[in-house]
Amino acid sequence: EAHKSEIAHRFNDLGEGHFKGLVLITLSQHLQKSPFEEHVKLVNEVTDFAKACVADESAQNCGKAIATLFGDKVCAIPSLRETYGELADCCAKEDPDRVECFLQHKDDNPNLPPFERPEPEALCTAFKENNDRFIGHYLYEVSRRHPYFYAPELLYYAEKYKNALTECCEAADKAACLTPKLDAIKEKALVSSAQQRLKCASLQKFGERAFKAWSVARLSQKFPKAEFAEISTIVTSLTKVTKECCHGDLLECADDRQELAKYMCEHQDSISSKLKECCVKPTLQKAHCILEIQRDELPTELPDLAVDFVEDKEVCKNFAEAKDVFLGTFLYEYSRRHPEYSIGMLLRIAKGYEAKLEKCCAEADPHACYAKVFDELQPLIDEPKKLVQQNCELFDKLGEYGFQNALAVRYTQKAPQVSTPTLVEYARKLGSVGTKCCSLPETERLSCTENYLALILNRLCILHEKTPVSERVTKCCTESLVNRRPCFSALHVDETYVPKPFHADSFTFHADICTLPEKEKQVKKQMALVELVKHKPKASEEQMKTVMGDFAAFLKKCCDADNKEACFTEDGPKLVAKCQATLA
């Protein structure tokens, strides 16, 4: 139904607290450099305006689209050009072009300091002084660093954050109470941010069909007892919600998400028995619970897919008449039967099936052509299974740090043009997948690994698009969303790369490394390792092992020495010469 005033409608649906939070997130995600106080001022103005529209929907400007109201607010900021430069040029455009222009100026890698957590005492003092302001500050700091964070989920994390502080600030040992709780929130929020970023990239770069296919596979795995029609209904709503959030229409997104949660709870009998525990929770927790829901048990009786998708005489007719519905049904049927496969695998299987039908249905004897289609799809299952097995074996053998080093070498060889800090960051992220997934049971390892890799590679692709340096990376990132991971896996040493000249500075260390926290020490060593590979991309594994061993011995010796700096100054050049000789 159409509302006279969209903003009044959303204010009424969401309530003042959530409304203000979402307005703050919207502003912080678009204006990532502005100080908190400036945003608070704008939030209050927008909220007062919304309240006026609730009182009188016919009041001036109340009938305007929310995006237009936000755009007008942003464009009225006097310091816009000096703070944001060419973002101010968007203000010369008319909506919807202005909205698109703002979106293009969102920065996935803003030059902001890391979000440091104050000491528990300081945290609690600030929280007790004004907890609304404190939580607002949390929303602001997270949103400006993660401009695509799923806004209604961020409200959920803010609520969790608030609950943790409420409980722990009364505890005798505040740090012991707070640290594990806040660490858990941070880790989950970072994964949530990456998941939403992949959804937005999927929609923006590969279109609605790609996102819908992803959603069909995921929901079919989670709700294997639901009918395809039910899955399709949810996917349609979910696509609308995700599009709205990715587009910056956060009030609409949060409201429609609430509606979707309500719909799912009203229809839980035909969706999943697991929804029961979610549906008794309050709004934010309910939607979060549904998002994270454990998958339902498989129906006891499911027929073989060959019956409908190979042997049925109407396969080509069904494929020709309603291609997307037919393939959607195939993806649904396959996914609900295979909860242990990753989304990427399922989509590649569906793509393989589609390609086979495209070819065979044009032939004289289609059935003879596609009769063995399922056996022909086997490599799509074998490849990731084998890869996960090999990498988990390597992880078990080397441990997380050693595994990261192996990945640093591997990825530097694949894309040596990428900057050293970026290669180290991704090697570390990829290495942590081993920790997350390799200890899981066999049936969960595969999906855990590939689903996480998809998130990490998506971030790599987003940052690489901003400053492209490698044609191979561009190719893997843009050709196909579902084939990104296999594409990166298939890359080997870049034969076109001209090795970097040797710079002793890259391998020069000082006594300060000895006092660094372990993680920073590792990063420094991994930077040197990547530089080494850029200098000698075809060095053998044995040579690399020797160099790394010498390097570790040198660090140990000098960090144990009485005069550390003298040791580094004296032995450093010797080490560099020895390494050059090893790699010659």
């Epitope: 006891t300 073989d304 897919l305 060959a306 049927e333 396959y334 086997q378």
Partner: nanobody, 123 residues
Framework: EVQLVESGGGLVQAGGSLRLSCAAS????????MGWFRQAPGKERERVVS????????YYADSVKGRFTISRDNAENTVYLQMNSLKPEDTAVYYC????????????????WGQGTLVTVSS
């Protein structure tokens, strides 16, 4: 440890019958779809028949339709293959297999395999 043990194979005249059994242990039998595969000398392993977890759905290769029947007894943790009107081309080693997740009955979906039992059909 999961074990699938086939029995009932042997030498039979063309046109005769055999009943193969596969006893499963070490797994929750009712959570697994079961299948029979066969491999003739010098040929690739092929699927013969499979049955869903509750026994409500079966799938037969064209070459055995109307002659072979699969059934299961979840109380006894056993799956059976009744083979009638046997032909010389049915000669092969027959393998029993179990699949936790099953969509297409392809070989790669099966998690556990038996050692096989030899069926020889003489003309």
């Amino acid at each position: 440890e999961v074990q699938l043990v086939e029995s009932g194979g042997g030498l039979v005249q063309a046109g005769g019958s055999l009943r193969l059994s596969c006893a499963a242990s070490g797994l929750t039998f009712s959570s697994y779809a079961m299948g029979w595969f066969r491999q003739a000398p010098g040929k690739e392993r092929e699927r013969v028949v499979s049955i869903s977890r509750g026994g409500g759905y079966t799938y037969y290769a064209d070459s055995v339709k109307g002659r072979f029947t699969i059934s299961r007894d979840n109380a006894e943790n056993t799956v059976y293959l009744q083979m009638n009107s046997l032909k010389p081309e049915d000669t092969a080693v027959y393998y029993c297999a179990a699949a936790r997740y099953w969509a297409t009955g392809s070989e790669y979906e099966f998690d556990y395999w038996g050692q096989g039992t030899l069926v020889t059909v003489s003309s």
